[in-house]
């Protein structure tokens, strides 16, 4: 019960983190003009990955896109394809996690090729969390450097537009929802790890037990269960009978003891 | 259309508070912001303050301690108070929508405001 | 507070020809965000509100006559009557919208020589 718990909760939190990250990739405000011991403007000046936008006080709100390919920084550019390597490996871990959860039934999936998909997703889930905060915090420190360095008429590194204006940027909202949503992702990939040890049977020695029935003669055979070796090996219990009686694979699969823990 | 009539006394007596109001048509104050300019007798334009779409205020330092725009949305009113008047204060008060670029795209007639005893 | 100083305070021209008012700010009106010159005009005919001509420094607004032009950037602009009419004769104001307060320029009068 815990296990499939750990990772239907994995699956969730993973869910959410990736659903952020999508969002603050799409978010424009990655960088907000710094407002502190600054003039106070009847415009306000904020940046994302993909357009810069100004808000007047009046509430009129124009954005523009970065059109230029080869005239962006590389740094932005950098930060662009973290974020985007984190969705995909995000999408395609939250695919594969849909198939390994323990409460979803796939034809005679055996719970091996389960555990094989939840340690997959997870460690996806994982580096998609890592890809979304070493995005997030790149473009952070170039904030932090750009701030510092920040006068009258510098290029911002930004859009590639001079400033006439000592406008300065700061940490935008995307930013910190970008961090939590990796953050929440990689958690989710853990704990997918972490459901992906208890889904996998473990080596188990078994001591033959023959005992004397009144009329037959049964002998569990030592050896009766064969182990599992790792992943992708036949982790059917193959119980074998005197008198050659089928086996586990030939009937309807119920819950065993590796079900739960 | 577009409409802005500013209303409110003719006189007033100094060290008084000075309202006047201006009533909107033609637009929602809940989307755009209204400017208060002045002008006095046989001189240039002044701005006094504004109060945007969302309800934020600013003000012209110089009049800051003294002066409070307000609206009333469901009204379509906006209010101006300029507390402690003096001679100095006479002018032809105007109200104006703010639109794009900030500017002032439409100007009511404005109301003259003497202030005497 | 940015001080908008306007020049000349009147200027006469003969009815068909240009005329130039020149506008200096003490702070730059450019915003880098969206590379707009917050820098409006305004036409003040006497007994009237002023009129809205052009804003963010060179975008007439509606229904202003083409012969009305504005350039500039940063500290420094000018608005242009291209061919003055009679109905041009007014008292021409420019204004900050960038920084608070939003200060007028002193006005530039109108005349016809």
């Known amino acids: 019960m815990a296990v499939t718990a750990c990772q239907g909760l994995g699956f969730v939190v993973s869910l959410i983190g990736i659903a952020g990250i999508i969002a603050a990739t799409c978010m424009d405000q990655w960088s907000t003009q710094d407002l502190y011991n600054n003039p106070v403007t009847a415009v306000f000046n904020y940046q994302g990955l993909w357009r810069s936008c100004v808000r007047e006080s009046s509430g009129f709100t124009e954005c523009r896109g970065y059109f230029t390919l080869l005239g962006l920084p590389a740094m932005l550019q950098a930060v662009r394809a973290l974020m985007i390597v984190g969705i995909v490996l995000g999408a395609i871990g939250l695919l594969v996690s849909i198939f390994a959860l323990k409460c979803i039934r796939i034809g005679s999936m055996e719970d091996s090729a389960k555990a094989n998909m939840t340690l997959t997703s997870g460690i996806m889930f994982i580096v998609s969390g890592l890809c979304a905060i070493a995005g997030v915090s790149v473009f952070a420190n170039m904030l932090v450097t750009n701030f510092w360095m920040s006068t009258a008429n510098m290029y911002t590194g930004m859009g590639g537009m001079v400033q006439t204006v000592q406008t300065r940027y700061t940490f935008g909202a995307a930013l910190f929802v970008g961090w939590v949503a990796g953050g929440l992702t990689l958690i989710g990939g853990v704990m997918m790890c972490i459901a992906c040890r208890g889904l996998a049977p473990e080596e188990t020695n078994y001591k033959a037990v023959s005992y004397h029935a009144s009329g037959h003669s049964v002998a569990y055979k030592p050896g009766g269960f064969k182990a599992s070796t790792g992943f992708g090996s036949n982790t059917k219990n193959k119980k074998i009978y005197d008198g050659g009686a089928r086996t586990e694979d030939e009937v309807q699969s119920y819950p065993s003891k590796h079900d739960y823990v | 259309q577009v409409q802005l009539q500013e209303s409110g006394p003719g006189l007033v007596k100094p060290s008084e508070t000075l309202s006047l109001t201006c009533t909107v048509s033609?637009?929602?104050?809940?989307?755009?912001?209204v400017s208060w300019i002045r002008q006095p007798p046989g001189k240039g334009l002044e701005w006094i303050g504004v109060?945007?779409?969302?309800?934020?205020?600013n003000y012209n330092p110089s009049l800051k301690s003294r002066v409070t725009i307000s609206k009333d949305s469901s009204k379509s009113q906006v209010s101006l108070k300029l507390s402690s008047v003096t001679a100095a204060d006479t002018a032809v008060y105007y109200c104006?929508?703010?639109?794009?670029?900030?500017?002032?795209?439409?100007w009511g007639q404005g109301t003259l405001v003497t202030v005497s005893s | 507070d940015i001080v908008m100083t306007q020049s000349p305070d009147s200027l006469a021209v003969s009815l068909g020809e240009r005329a130039t008012i020149n506008c200096k700010s003490s702070?730059?009106?450019?915003?880098?965000?969206?590379?707009?010159?917050?820098l409006t005009w305004y036409q003040q005919k006497p007994g009237q509100p002023p009129k809205l001509l052009i804003y963010?420094?060179?975008t007439r607004d509606s229904g202003v006559p083409d012969r009305f032009s504005g350039s500039g950037s940063g500290t420094d602009f000018t608005l242009t009557i291209s061919s003055l009419q009679a109905e041009d004769v007014a008292v021409y104001y420019c204004?900050?919208?960038?920084?608070?307060?939003?200060?007028f320029g002193g006005g530039t009068k109108v005349e016809i020589k």
């Open positions: 204004q900050n919208d960038f920084i608070f307060p939003l200060t």
């Open positions: 963010w420094a060179s």
């Open positions: 109060i945007w779409g969302d309800g934020n205020t």
């Open positions: 104006a929508r703010v639109n794009f670029g900030n500017a002032l795209d439409y």
């Open positions: 702070q730059s009106l450019l915003n880098s965000g969206n590379q707009k010159n917050y």
């Open positions: 033609g637009f929602s104050l809940t989307r755009y912001g």
